[in-house]
Amino acid sequence: AAPCPDACCPHGSSGLRCTRDGALDSLHHLPGAENLTELYIENQQHLQHLELRDLRGLGELRNLTIVKSGLRFVAPDAFHFTPRLSRLNLSFNALESLSWKTVQGLSLQELVLSGNPLHCSCALRWLQRWEEEGLGGVPEQKLQCHGQGPLAHMPNASCGVPTLKVQVPNASVDVGDDVLLRCQVEGRGLEQAGWILTELEQSATVMKSGGLPSLGLTLANVTSDLNRKNVTCWAENDVGRAEVSVQVNVSFPASVQLHTAVEMHHWCIPFSVDGQPAPSLRWLFNGSVLNETSFIFTEFLEPAANETVRHGCLRLNQPTHVNNGNYTLLAANPFGQASASIMAAFMDNPFEFNPEDPIPVSFSPVDTNSTSGDPVEKKDETPFGVSVAVG
């Protein structure tokens, strides 16, 4: 094949090599950029900055090598458009530092920075940590800071991410109230801070105020939906990012719903209860307090992390006619109480039939493992003339 006269030449099916001395000062308009998986750049003394726009359109890029060139600065968001990048070789350039943000969000298997005049500072604490933890092949490079010795020996006692304290109201918050949250940020070299409010949706009207080092957030006219929702304060410095999440408890009275009994492996009277604080529950059977036992008891489903409502069952193991009747669920918290009732009829009296004269009912064997916590049944022959589903 004839030698390639261009600044950059194809290499394999999806690679590009740019090695002609001084031919590039940016990476705009590389040929076939959208399909590139590998880009090799060498001897480009005029290529001094790598920024967001340089790698736009290189969404398939896996390997990027820029060596023996003039690279002085890599923007924190330079690789935003190359999320698949797994190997990054920036050796033998003029880099004094590289922000932690540059590699955040990437899954780098390899990061090569040897041969750069790195300047030891807290901004490279993340790289020192990579070296300590054996990440990205960094330890093998024995990185040095220009005139300062090994990166591994850099003092790091003062290199911490920001410290955040979020103040929430001590007093009870009611529906319709306005709530002021304050986030105090401490630390060296603070760069940015803010609130993450993605979970709030229609839970309140949001107004932000203030700036570093004290950020205010007013949640106006809060609803009960605000419960279990994270309000997050974040801050960044040259070392890294810190986040603290809080939740605001909005008090509201207990409520309860009951549904018709259903037969599963066992019988279940489904219920839903809501309220903040979480209500205490009590069952009545035909107007009298129901004492829970291993035959009749309250069973909760796994709660959703972001809501206060709890779903569950009054579970009845093999109920008989004595369990037929009126079931009432009482729910109460300091802000109110509620109740709901339902009639349940599980069966007629099964003990009045003559066992000498059974009604034959045939069931298929069940040999699978039991997931219900009930014994695994082999077969069910019911002499009481009451057909039952076998779970």
Epitope: N291, F297, Q318, H321, G373, P375
Partner: antibody, heavy 115, light 108 residues
Framework: EVQLQESGPGLVKPSGTLSLTCAVS?????????WTWVRQPPGKGLEWIGE???????NYNPSLKSRVTISVDKSKNQFSLKLSSVTAADTAVYYC????????WGQGTLVTVSS | SSELTQDPAVSVALGQTVRITCQGA??????ASWYQQKPGQAPVLVIY???KRPSGIPDRFSGSSSGNTASLTITGAQAEDEADYYC???????????FGGGTKLTVL
């Protein structure tokens, strides 16, 4: 498969407290099951002692209620029995089991009350 | 009263059918469960609830109930069925459990 294993001292002095633990393996003590203690004096029948649910509900045999405490430790996946003011009549093999049907049992541990 | 009464001993010829009974007021309200216990071993559940049989229990074991009496029937008794059999149910109050005194089954 659920397995239960009782452990505790085999000899308790009269008027002392009998303490046993039942370790549950092959399943979570926080499942939708209750856990129970049953005892059997030598050469005699079975006697139900009491039961507990992981949320703290418990029920005891009325004849033993004043002396019995059953507790659960979810972090260790185990539950325990304490029987106070024991006498020779409390000498028995003590079993733990899964309620309500007692479909899984421990192998039992003999506790002798003697000075 | 919170009692379940069983015959202390019952015998059966090999291959024949035997019925072990359990009497008590609570059996008008609640199901009996049945346990087999061999010397030096923990009891084993054989019947529970509405004549339900756990996995691994032969179908020669069945349960029934009428009035205040629950019965465990072994149809075609085998030598390995020789054991003590205990019934259990909820007490009439429903708040605790009671066992019968046990029946020693001998297979001849």
């Amino acid at each position: 498969e659920v397995q239960l294993q009782e452990s505790g001292p085999g000899l308790v002095k009269p008027s002392g407290t009998l303490s046993l633990t039942c370790a549950v393996s092959g399943g979570s003590i926080s499942s939708s099951n209750w856990w129970t203690w049953v005892r059997q004096p030598p050469g005699k029948g079975l006697e139900w002692i009491g039961e507990i649910y992981h949320r703290g509900n418990r029920n005891y045999n009325p004849s033993l209620k004043s002396r019995v405490t059953i507790s659960v430790d979810k972090s260790k996946n185990q539950f325990s029995l304490k029987l106070s003011s024991v006498t020779a009549a409390d000498t028995a093999v003590y079993y733990c089991a899964r309620a309500p049907w007692f479909d899984y049992w421990g192998q039992g541990t003999l506790v002798t009350v003697s000075s | 009263s919170s009692e379940l009464t069983q015959d202390p001993a019952v015998s059966v010829a090999l291959g024949q059918t035997v019925r072990i009974t359990c009497q008590g007021a609570s059996l008008r309200s609640y199901y009996a469960s049945w346990y087999q216990q061999k010397p030096g071993q923990a009891p084993v559940l054989v019947i529970y609830g509405k004549n339900k049989r756990p996995s691994g229990i032969p179908d020669r074991f069945s349960g029934s109930s009428s009035g205040n009496t629950a019965s465990l029937t072994i149809t075609g008794a085998q030598a390995e069925d020789e054991a003590d059999y205990y019934c259990a149910s909820q007490a009439s109050s429903g708040n605790h459990l009671i066992f019968g005194g046990g029946t020693k089954l001998t297979v001849l």
